[in-house]
C-alpha cells in the first residue's frame, strides 16, 4: 500500500479521530461508573418485605383478638341484661312470697324452660336409641341373609378350566355351523314349497356362506385355540406366569388373517328375552 | 403512586431501558473479504472513520447517556419511595406497640368486668334461690317429669343389653364374612392377549347367533303354518 | 498518535469492531442495572400497596379498640348499677333468714335434675355407640367385584348357549312343520296324479 509521512494532515486527522473517540469511550465509562444506580442493599429489600409481612401477621392476630373480645363483650352484655331481669324477678318473688293466693298457682305452673328442653331431648334420644337398635338389628339380619345367599351361589358356580373355556368356544362354533346348515336347508325347503322367499340376507360375508369361507373361519378358530392353549402351557412352565407367551409368526399371521376377514360387531348380549336362564356354569 | 408509571408488567422497566438502547442504524459495513488487505486512500479512510464514530456517538453513546439518566431518575424515585416506606414502617412499628398495649389493657378490663359479672350472677342465683326455697311445693308438671324419668333407667338397661348384643352380632358376622372373602377364589389368569382373542371370538359367534335368531324370527313371521 | 502508514480496511474494521464490543459491553452493564432496578421497582410497588393496606387496617383496629373500650366502660357502669340494686335485696334476705328453712320440695327438685342429667348422659353415650355401629355398617358394605373378565366371559357364553338352545328348538320345530307340509303336498300330488290318470284312462 501507499506510505504517508507523519506530517500528512489527513493521516494526522485519522490518528486524532481515533485518539479522540477512544477518549470519548473512556469518558462514557467514567460517567457510567460515577453514576449511582443503587436503590438499596438486598438486606434492605428483604427487610422491607419481611417487616410489612410481620406487621400484616400482627394485625391479623390483633384483629382476631379484638373480634373475639367483641363477641365476649356481647355475651357479657347479655348476662348483664339477665342480671337486671334476675333482680326484677327476685323483687317480684319477694312480693309474691307474701301473697297467700299465689301458692295455689304454684301447683299449676309449667316446667321451667331448661327442664322442659331437657325432657324433650331425653324423649327424643330415647326414641332414637330404641328404633336405631331395631334398625341395626334388621340390617345385620339382612346382610347375613345376603351373605348366605351369596355363599350358596358361589358354591354353585364352577369356574371353568382354561381348556373348558376354549372347548366351549370351539363347540359353540361347531354348533353354529351345524345350525347354519340346518337353517339353510330349512330355507331351501321353504323356498321349494314356495312358502318363503329369503328377505333377510346374512350381514356376514354372504347370504349363504360359501364352504370355503366357513372352512377358513374354522381353521382360523382351530389355530387360535391351539395358540391359546400353547400360550397356556408355556405360561405354566415359566416361573413368571403373568407374562403371556408370544405367538409364533405363523400363528400371528393366521390370527391376523382371521380377524381381518370380518367386520367388528358391537359386543352385546345376544340372548332373546324369552330364553331360559344361563346354562354353561350352573350345575344341572 | 408515582411508581405505577412503568410498572404495568413485572419486567417493564428493563424493557423500557432496552427500547431506549435500541439502535435504529446498523454499524458501518466494510468491503468484501478479498479487498480487506488493501489500504484505502487516507481521505476515504478518515471519512469512513468519521462516519463510524458519528454512528457510534448517535446510536450508542447518546442512547447510553439517555439510559443512564433514565435509570438515575428511576433510582432517585425509588430511593425516595424506599425512604418513605421505611418511615411508614417505623410509624407502623410504633402503632403496633400502642395497639398491643391497648389490646392488653382491653383484655385486663374485660377480665375485670367478667369476674365482676360472675360475682354478681352468683349473688343473684343465691338471692333467687333464697326466695324460691321459701316455696314448699313441687308443681304438677314437676311431679309428672319426676315420674316419667324414674321409669327410664330400667328401659335403658334393656337397651344397653340390646346394643351389646347387636355389637357382638356385628363382630361375629363380620368375622365370618371376612373369612369367606379371604378364601382363595379359583380363577383362571388370562393374559391380555388371550382376553382379546376370546372377546373377538365371542363377538363373532354372537353376531352369527344374532343372525340366525333373526332368520328364524323372519321365517316365523313370513310363513303361516 | 498518527499512524505511520495507511490503514487497511481490515485494520479499520478491527478497530471499529473493538469499539463496537466495548460499547455493547457497556450496554450490557446498563441492562444489568435495569434488571436490579426492576427488582426494586416490583418490591416497592408491592410493598407500597401492602403498607397502604396496613395503614387502613391499623386505623380500623384502632377504631375497633376504641369502641370496645367504650363498651367495657359502659358495662362496668351498668354492673355498678346492678350491684346497687342487689345489695338491699340481700339485706332483706339476711333479715328473714331466721324464719327460712330449706324445704323438702327443693331437695326433690334437685334430685330430679340430677336424674335427668344422668339419663341424658347415658342416652347420649348409647346414641353415639349406635351411630358408630351404623357408620361402620355403611362403610363396610362394599359391592362385590363384578369386573372379573372371566365372569363376563362366562355370562356371555351362557347367553350364547341359551340362544343356541333356542335356535335348536325353533329350527327343529320349523323342520317338523316343513316335513308335515311336504307330506301333505306329496299326498296331494299323488292324489292329483291318480285322478289325472283316471280321467285319461
Amino acid at each position: 500500500g501507499h506510505q504517508w509521512k507523519d506530517s500528512d494532515p489527513v493521516m494526522a486527522g485519522i490518528g486524532e479521530e481515533i485518539a479522540h473517540f477512544q477518549k470519548e469511550l473512556e469518558e462514557l465509562k467514567a460517567r457510567t461508573s460515577k453514576a449511582c444506580f443503587q436503590v438499596g442493599t438486598s438486606e434492605e429489600m428483604k427487610m422491607l418485605r419481611t417487616e410489612s409481612d410481620d406487621l400484616h401477621t400482627f394485625l391479623l392476630e390483633i384483629k382476631e383478638t379484638t373480634e373475639s373480645l367483641h363477641g365476649d363483650i356481647s355475651s357479657l352484655k347479655t348476662t348483664l341484661l339477665e342480671g337486671f331481669a334476675g333482680v326484677e324477678e327476685a323483687r317480684e318473688q319477694n312480693e309474691r312470697n307474701r301473697d297467700s293466693g299465689y301458692l295455689h298457682l304454684l301447683y299449676k305452673r309449667p316446667l321451667d324452660p331448661k327442664s322442659e328442653a331437657q325432657l324433650q331431648e331425653i324423649r327424643r334420644l330415647h326414641q332414637y336409641v330404641k328404633f336405631a337398635v331395631q334398625d341395626v338389628n334388621d340390617v345385620l339380619d339382612l346382610e347375613w341373609d345376603q351373605h348366605l345367599e351369596q355363599k350358596k351361589k358361589q358354591r354353585h358356580l364352577l369356574v371353568p378350566e382354561r381348556e373348558t373355556l376354549f372347548n366351549t368356544l370351539a363347540n359353540n362354533r361347531e354348533i353354529i355351523n351345524q345350525q347354519r346348515k340346518r337353517l339353510n336347508h330349512l330355507v331351501d325347503s321353504l323356498q321349494q314349497l314356495r312358502l318363503y322367499k329369503q328377505t333377510s340376507l346374512w350381514s356376514l360375508s354372504s347370504a349363504v356362506p360359501s364352504q370355503s369361507s366357513i372352512h377358513s373361519f374354522d381353521s382360523d378358530l382351530e389355530s387360535l385355540c391351539n395358540a391359546l392353549l400353547k400360550t397356556t402351557i408355556e405360561s405354566h412352565t415359566k416361573s413368571l406366569p403373568k407374562v403371556p407367551a408370544k405367538l409364533s409368526p405363523m400363528k400371528q399371521a393366521q390370527l391376523r388373517n382371521f380377524l381381518a376377514k370380518r367386520k367388528t360387531p358391537p359386543v352385546r348380549s345376544t340372548a332373546p328375552a324369552s330364553l331360559s336362564r344361563s346354562a354353561f356354569l350352573s350345575q344341572r | 403512586s408515582p411508581l405505577r408509571v412503568l410498572a404495568e408488567t413485572p419486567d417493564s422497566f428493563e424493557k423500557h431501558i432496552r427500547s431506549i438502547l435500541q439502535r435504529s442504524v446498523a454499524n458501518p459495513a466494510f468491503l468484501k473479504a478479498s479487498e480487506k488487505d488493501i489500504a484505502p486512500p487516507p481521505e476515504e479512510c478518515l471519512q469512513l472513520l468519521s462516519r463510524a464514530t458519528q454512528v457510534f456517538r448517535e446510536q450508542y453513546i447518546l442512547k447510553q447517556d439517555l439510559a443512564k439518566e433514565e435509570i438515575q431518575r428511576r433510582v432517585k424515585l425509588l430511593c425516595d419511595q424506599k425512604k418513605k416506606q421505611l418511615e411508614d414502617l417505623s410509624y407502623c412499628r410504633e402503632e403496633r406497640k400502642s395497639l398491643r398495649e391497648m389490646a392488653e389493657r382491653l383484655a385486663d378490663k374485660y377480665e375485670e368486668a367478667k369476674e365482676k359479672q360472675e360475682d354478681i350472677m352468683n349473688r343473684m342465683k343465691k338471692l333467687l334461690h333464697s326466695f324460691h326455697s321459701e316455696l314448699p311445693v313441687l308443681s304438677d308438671s314437676e311431679r309428672d317429669m319426676k315420674k316419667e324419668l324414674q321409669l327410664i333407667p330400667d328401659q335403658l338397661r334393656h337397651l344397653g343389653n340390646a346394643i351389646k348384643q347387636v355389637t357382638m352380632k356385628k363382630d361375629y358376622q363380620q368375622q365370618k364374612m371376612e373369612k369367606v372373602l379371604s378364601l382363595p377364589k379359583p380363577t383362571i389368569i388370562l393374559s391380555a392377549y388371550q382376553r382379546k382373542c376370546i372377546q373377538s371370538i365371542l363377538k363373532e359367534e354372537g353376531e352369527h347367533i344374532r343372525e340366525m335368531v333373526k332368520q328364524i324370527n323372519d321365517i316365523r313371521n313370513h310363513v303361516n303354518f | 498518535a498518527a499512524a505511520s502508514s495507511a490503514m487497511t480496511y481490515a485494520q479499520l474494521e478491527s478497530l471499529i469492531n473493538k469499539w463496537s464490543l466495548e460499547l455493547e459491553d457497556q450496554e450490557r452493564h446498563f441492562l444489568q442495572q435495569a434488571t436490579q432496578v426492576n427488582a426494586w421497582d416490583r418490591t416497592l410497588i408491592e410493598n407500597g400497596e401492602k403498607i397502604t393496606s396496613l395503614h387502613r387496617e391499623v386505623e380500623k383496629v384502632k377504631l375497633d379498640q376504641k369502641r370496645l373500650d367504650q363498651e367495657l366502660d359502659f358495662i362496668l357502669s351498668q354492673q355498678k348499677e346492678l350491684e346497687d340494686l342487689l345489695s338491699p335485696l340481700e339485706e332483706l334476705v339476711k333479715e328473714q333468714s331466721g324464719t327460712i328453712y330449706l324445704q323438702h320440695a327443693d331437695e326433690e327438685r334437685e334430685k330430679t335434675y340430677k336424674l335427668a342429667e344422668n339419663i341424658d348422659a347415658q342416652l347420649k353415650r348409647m346414641a353415639q355407640d349406635l351411630k358408630d355401629i351404623i357408620e361402620h355398617l355403611n362403610t363396610s358394605g362394599a359391592p362385590a367385584d363384578t369386573s372379573d373378565p372371566l365372569q363376563q366371559i362366562c355370562k356371555i357364553l351362557n347367553a350364547h348357549m341359551d340362544s343356541l338352545q333356542w335356535i335348536d328348538q325353533n329350527s327343529a320345530l320349523l323342520q317338523r312343520k316343513v316335513e308335515e307340509v311336504t307330506k301333505v303336498c306329496e299326498g296331494r300330488r299323488k292324489e292329483q296324479e291318480r285322478s289325472f290318470r283316471i280321467t285319461f284312462d
Partner: nanobody
C-alpha cells in the same frame, strides 16, 4: 405543551463565530438531555453536540474544538457557541430535548457560512 425555540442563526463569513440559543418550556428541563442537530440541504440530520442533565458534553468529530455546548438550568436555555466556522457548517440547526423515549425538536434556525 413542549416548546423549543432556536435563535441566533444568520449569515457569517468563514472563520467567523455565531452563538445559537434555544429556549425550552413545557417540560421539566433538568430531566432532559439537550442536543443540537444540523441538516444541510440534501443530507440527513446529524448530531452536532449534546449535554446531559449533569453537564457532561459530547461533540461530533466535525464540531470538536470549535463548538461549545452549555446549558442554564435556571433559565431553561441551552446554547451552542460556534467559532472558526467553515463553509461546510452551513445548515439548519435544530435544538432537541431528549428523555427516555421522548424526543422533541425545535423548528430550527438557519446558519449560512459564505464568503
Amino acid at each position: 405543551q413542549v416548546q423549543l425555540v432556536e435563535s441566533g442563526g444568520g449569515l457569517v463569513q468563514p472563520g467567523g463565530s455565531l452563538r445559537l440559543s434555544c429556549a425550552a418550556s413545557g417540560f421539566t428541563f433538568t430531566d432532559y438531555l439537550m442536543a443540537w442537530y444540523r441538516q444541510a440541504p440534501g443530507n440527513q440530520r446529524q448530531l452536532v453536540a449534546y449535554i446531559t442533565s449533569d453537564g457532561s458534553t459530547v461533540y461530533a468529530s466535525s464540531a470538536r474544538g470549535r463548538f461549545t455546548i452549555s446549558r442554564d438550568n435556571a433559565k431553561n436555555t441551552v446554547t451552542l457557541q460556534m467559532n472558526s466556522l467553515l463553509l461546510d457548517d452551513t445548515a439548519v440547526y435544530y435544538c432537541s430535548a431528549k428523555s427516555g423515549l421522548k424526543d422533541y425538536y425545535g423548528q430550527g434556525t438557519q446558519v449560512t457560512v459564505s464568503s
